[in-house]
């Protein structure tokens, strides 16, 4: 006799892992033999998909590799003609091992900022993500939490964060591990110890120290006057992420000496700066300080205008005498190149006569001033208009140091030959005659303040620097 | 770090020629004088030749005038000198040293290691 | 021609002090010739310990003091150390016609 379908064995919900087998089993009693049909999520299942396997006249339906996205309702649908259609439904749950679906990467944060790395994970049932940093679990804290998402979130991310990470996805199924990241955290240059400003007498040599620190450890470059250095010698040392530089100066004029530190985060660089100053203290001048000694010069810029193995004094007051002495020397012969002609010879031999002078030689050695005629002939005769263009200078501040203060004698303090002539040197290179002063260049309107002495005469019937010549 | 580093030398037969180099770093190379100074085997220091800090002036032993020739490259930091004539005599290690000043004698503060030169048939 | 002489070696007990000198073959050592001396070790370069008649280079311990006795110049070293074992020279800057500067032929000197 025809009978209606009757399910006998309802679906039940069933549970699979990915790529493993589930079957769903759809036992019917009827006659004649219904036809079975399958759904899933009300969708038919085509007889013909081979990831299906329908058997036992369309009873049992496997799929044969779990794919996650097979989850849903499952529907078995029995008709035969007699009576109506029956229906049963079940729940595949695919079941999963956790699965890393974005993983963490390598991070580059600046300090204090706020660090994310990422990790977002699939699993059933769904994975709880915990973090590991070198080989401990990860506490979190108020700074360091683990979002919902299962990325690891830290505000204000400080030095000590910096290190290896990788986070760990774990179900009742199994574990799974993502692969180690490195957190690098980066520190803006800071100075530690900025260099300290001095008050040092002139010819000194002073020792700028700066540190500064940062990751990557930070460079340092000064700066002297709001321009590179261009003179000292610079000496560095790395330890400990903190960079040590001394910048070693032979102190001839005042300045602002900037310490700066830079370090690059990626296309951006970071600087911290310091700035210390360096100011000439009052000194005495060579003729009111007889702390010296007498040596043969030996340098380069006076070499044509001191006599070949002229003694000269050399002032204890600096602290390296020669080179001082020799870089002032130096420094005002460059002022000189603009100078005229005539000025020049002139000046140059009142400059090396004057910061090179002539040391007698004793139990106390003592410098022997220029006599003041052979000054006033360079001031008020070689050297009238260039003399009131430095004074103008000197008095309006255009130079750049003291040291021309320091290189051009006044003329009315130095003794005169007329004196004691052994009490003061002679410039054996200003050798002329009245006649001379005939070619020589209008004087100034002020009359000499003394009067410029009958030198003696020569052969020579113009103005001379050569060292053969003497005045004696 | 004051640093000197010597180079070129070598063996030479006599009336060879060499050119040593010195490459300075560590210091501000053109505010300084420099000077080589030599030993051979076994014996004292002999200075050889010495420049101030911008060239120009140049000195030598007397032994050394017209066969040998300093010079500098303030832009390479690099100190030379040109050998020219050699004699067994000259058979020594070269020092490069770095005056403590501007002047072309002021004391040697800073020695190089070396280079050697043989002179020898 | 200059020639600088010293004592060709010289021998002091550790602790104790010794003076080397660095004299001329015609006339007196004075500040003129910037008397410097300088340390040499067997294999290594020379290292500077005085300038100038007096002034110590930088990072050289004060045992170490340069001056003029009489018509030469003197190396003094004071409380003498084992390490202080080595060759000394003394440079002299020199003036007869044209500049120049003249090494001693050295010290050796042995602490017992």
């Known amino acids: 006799l025809p009978k209606a379908p009757v399910i006998t064995t309802p679906l039940e919900t069933v549970d699979a892992l990915v790529e493993e087998v589930a079957t769903f089993m759809c036992a019917v009693e009827s006659y004649p033999q219904p036809e079975i049909s399958w759904t899933r999520n009300k969708i038919l299942i085509k007889l013909f998909d081979t990831r299906y396997s329908i058997r036992e006249n369309g009873q049992l339906l496997t799929i044969l590799s779990v794919e996650d996205s097979d989850d849903g309702i499952y529907c078995c649908t029995a008709n035969n003609g007699v009576g109506g259609a029956v229906e049963s439904c079940g729940a595949l749950q695919v079941k999963m091992k956790p699965k890393i679906t974005r993983p963490p990467i390598n991070v580059k944060i600046i300090e204090g900022l706020k660090a994310v790395l990422p990790c977002t994970t699939m699993g059933n049932p769904k994975p709880s993500v915990s973090w590991i940093k070198g080989d401990s679990p990860l506490r979190e804290n108020s700074r360091i939490a683990v979002l919902e998402s299962g990325s690891l979130r830290i505000h204000n991310v400080q030095k000590e964060d910096a290190g290896q990470y990788r986070c760990v996805a774990k179900n009742s199924l199994g574990t799974a591990y993502s692969k180690v990241v490195k957190l690098e955290v980066e520190v803006f240059a800071r100075i530690l110890r900025a260099p300290e400003s001095h008050n040092v007498t002139f010819g000194s040599f002073v020792t700028l120290h700066c540190t500064a620190t940062g990751i990557p450890v930070p460079t340092i470059t000064w700066i002297e006057n709001g321009n590179a250095v261009s003179s000292g010698s610079i000496q560095e040392s790395v330890k400990d992420r903190v960079i040590d530089s001394r910048l070693q100066l032979f102190i001839t004029k005042p300045g602002l000496y900037t310490c700066i530190a830079t370090n690059k985060h990626g296309e951006k660089f970071s600087t911290a700066k310091a700035a210390a100053t360096i100011s000439i203290a009052e000194w005495s001048k060579p003729q009111k300080d007889n702390k010296g000694y007498c040596a043969q010069y030996r340098g380069e810029v006076c070499n044509a205008v001191l006599a070949k193995d002229a003694l000269v004094f050399l002032n204890t007051s600096y602290a390296d005498p020669e080179e001082a002495q020799e870089l002032l020397v130096h420094t005002a012969w460059n002022e000189l190149k603009v100078v005229s002609p005539v000025c020049r010879p002139a000046a140059e031999a009142l400059l090396c006569n004057h910061i090179f002078q002539e040391c007698s030689p004793g139990v106390v050695p003592t410098p022997i001033p220029i006599c003041r005629e052979y000054c006033l002939a360079v001031k008020e005769l070689f050297c009238a208009k260039e003399w009131l263009v430095m004074e103008e200078k000197t008095h309006r501040g255009l130079y750049r140091s003291e040291m021309h203060l320091l290189s051009v004698p006044e003329c009315s303090k130095l003794p005169s030959m007329h004196w004691d002539p052994t009490a003061c040197a002679r410039l054996p290179h200003l050798d002329y005659n009245k006649e001379n002063l005939k070619t020589f260049p209008p004087m100034t309107s002020s009359k000499p303040s003394v009067d410029i002495p009958n030198l003696p005469s020569s052969s020579s019937s113009s103005f001379s620097v050569s060292p053969t010549y003497s005045m004696t | 770090e004051v640093q000197l580093l010597e180079s070129g030398g070598g063996l030479v037969q006599p009336g060879g020629s060499l050119r040593l180099s010195c490459a300075a770093s560590?210091?501000?190379?053109?505010?300084?004088?420099m000077s080589w100074v030599r030993q051979a085997p076994g014996k004292g220091l002999e200075w050889v030749s010495a420049?101030?800090?911008?060239?120009?002036?140049?000195y030598y032993k007397e032994s050394v005038k017209g066969r040998f020739t300093i010079s500098r490259d303030n832009s390479k930091n690099t100190l030379y000198l040109q050998m020219n004539s050699l004699r067994a005599e000259d058979t020594a290690v070269y020092y490069c040293?770095?005056?403590?000043?501007?002047?072309?004698?002021?004391?040697?503060?800073?020695w190089g290691q070396g280079t050697l030169v043989t002179v020898s048939s | 021609q200059t020639v600088v002489t010293q004592e060709p070696s010289f021998s002091v007990s550790p602790g104790g002090t010794v003076t080397l000198t660095c004299g001329l073959s015609?006339?007196?050592?004075?500040?003129?010739?910037?008397p410097d001396w300088y340390q040499q070790t067997p294999g290594q370069a020379p290292r500077t310990l005085i300038y100038?008649?007096?002034s110590r280079h930088s990072g050289v311990p004060d045992r170490f003091s340069g001056s003029i006795l009489g018509n030469k110049a003197a190396l003094t070293i004071t409380g003498a150390q084992a390490d202080d074992e080595s060759d000394y020279y003394c440079?002299?800057?020199?003036?007869?016609?044209?500049?120049?500067?003249?090494f001693g032929g050295g010290t050796k000197l042995t602490v017992l």
């Open positions: 040293a770095k005056r403590s000043g501007r002047i072309a004698f002021g004391a040697l503060d800073a």
């Open positions: 015609s006339g007196s050592v004075t500040s003129s010739n910037y």
């Open positions: 440079g002299l800057y020199s003036y007869s016609g044209s500049k120049n500067y003249v």
């Open positions: 420049i101030p800090w911008q060239g120009g002036s140049t």
């Open positions: 100038s008649t007096d």
């Open positions: 560590g210091f501000t190379f053109s505010d300084y004088g």
